[in-house]
């Protein structure tokens, strides 16, 4: 039995920040779970982890240097990524694991979300006229 995950196919991070919502076919509110976000086609980089236990506060952390926060809905986890770099444009996959009560459950691999990071564009400086000719 696998949990199904839905993600937006593509998101654009205009201000180097983005909200990525992972929607699950599963109620997480009465479970101990570990939701994570992975970068790359091979999911090699674990970007952010949200650890939840129905009776305690959410734990949100990144061991890979990403600036992230997380929010829990009853069937979703939203990852808020900030300070993204243009070169972190990639495909990102949501993963969910239900640790307790047993049995352990995880998800079918989702289609992922391409996050396109557009760097902050500085406002172009006004064009000054050249020096006046004598």
């Amino acid at each position: 039995n696998k949990i199904l995950v839905k993600q937006s196919p593509m998101l654009v991070a205009y201000d180097n920040a983005v909200n990525l919502s992972c929607k699950y076919s599963y109620n997480l509110f009465s479970r101990e779970f570990r939701a994570s976000l992975h970068k790359g086609l091979d999911s090699a980089v674990e970007v952010c982890v949200v650890y939840g236990n129905y009776s305690q506060q959410l734990q949100v952390y990144s061991k890979t240097g990403f600036n992230c926060d997380g929010k829990l809905g009853n069937e979703s986890v939203t990852f808020y990524l900030q300070n993204l770099y243009v070169n972190q444009t990639d495909i990102y996959f949501c993963k969910i694991e239900v640790m307790y009560p047993p049995p352990y459950l995880d998800n079918e691999k989702s289609n992922g979300t391409i996050i396109h990071v557009k760097g902050k564009h500085l406002c172009p400086s006004p064009l000054f006229p050249g020096p006046s000719k004598p």
Epitope: Y26, N27, S30, V98, P101, P102, P103, L105
Partner: antibody
Framework: QVQLVQSGAEVKKPGASVKVSCKAS????????IHWVRQAPGQGLEWMGW????????NYAQKFQGRVTMTRDTSISTAYMELSSLRSEDTAVYYC??????????????WGQGTLVTVSS | DIQMTQSPSSLSASVGDRVTITCRTN??????LAWYQQKPGKAPKLLIY???HLVEGVPSRFSGSGSGTDFTLTISSLQPEDFATYYC?????????FGGGTKVEIK
């Protein structure tokens, strides 16, 4: 189809122990939690605890901690509930029930027929 | 531990009546609640899970509502086979306590 068949009625003396069995069929025994619930004569349902045959994970109600032991024999798909230091207040029908996970919502859709345990001197 | 307060403890009704049973918890359990029907000498039968979801095969005259701390089981038109005792049970952590039960008797 899913079936839980329990052992027969027992009469025990105060201070003794009783071991009730619950034989599962129609599904993979090690993949579902088994709950134990009891009902004293003319009273409501009382939750005793749950047991996961796949890993021996157990969760007992505080009231029964130290007196109840839930075990299993996977080779014969059977769960057991043993209650020790019996007293007259333990006279009840004891039920096993399978917990199903409805996409993260739990419930007990399958129940054994119940085992009457009478504690009397 | 979560306390389950079920009311009324008993009620008398006639065939065709609309019957409402309530279950209140002392803390938010979201929708993690089930309802059961039990007839004398029989094991309980699951009617509703996740507070509002009717189990397959259970007649549509049964319905569940509520979330958080207040829940209701409604029988829209009581039938002769519905005279029984009804229990709620929470699944928000352990112990998975039952309500005290509501006995539905013939008026």
């Amino acid at each position: 189809q899913v079936q839980l068949v329990q052992s027969g009625a027992e009469v025990k003396k105060p201070g003794a122990s009783v071991k009730v069995s619950c034989k599962a069929s129609g599904y993979t025994f090690t993949e579902y939690i088994i709950h134990w619930v009891r009902q004293a004569p003319g009273q409501g349902l009382e939750w005793m605890g749950w047991f996961y045959p796949g890993s021996n994970d157990i969760n007992y109600a505080q009231k029964f901690q130290g007196r109840v032991t839930m075990t299993r024999d996977t080779s014969i798909s059977t769960a057991y509930m043993e209650l020790s230091s019996l007293r007259s207040e333990d006279t009840a029908v004891y039920y096993c029930a399978r917990r199903d996970d409805f996409s993260g919502y739990d419930a007990l859709p399958y129940w054994g027929q119940g085992t009457l345990v009478t504690v009397s001197s | 531990d979560i306390q389950m307060t079920q009311s009324p403890s008993s009620l008398s009704a006639s065939v065709g009546d609309r019957v409402t049973i309530t279950c209140r918890t002392n803390e938010n359990i979201y929708s993690n609640l089930a309802w059961y029907q039990q007839k004398p000498g029989k094991a309980p039968k699951l009617l509703i899970y996740a507070a509002t979801h009717l189990v397959e095969g259970v007649p549509s005259r049964f319905s569940g509502s509520g979330s958080g701390t207040d829940f209701t089981l409604t029988i829209s038109s009581l039938q002769p086979e519905d005279f029984a005792t009804y229990y709620c049970q929470h699944f928000w952590g352990t112990p998975c306590t039952f309500g005290g039960g509501t006995k539905v008797e013939i008026k």
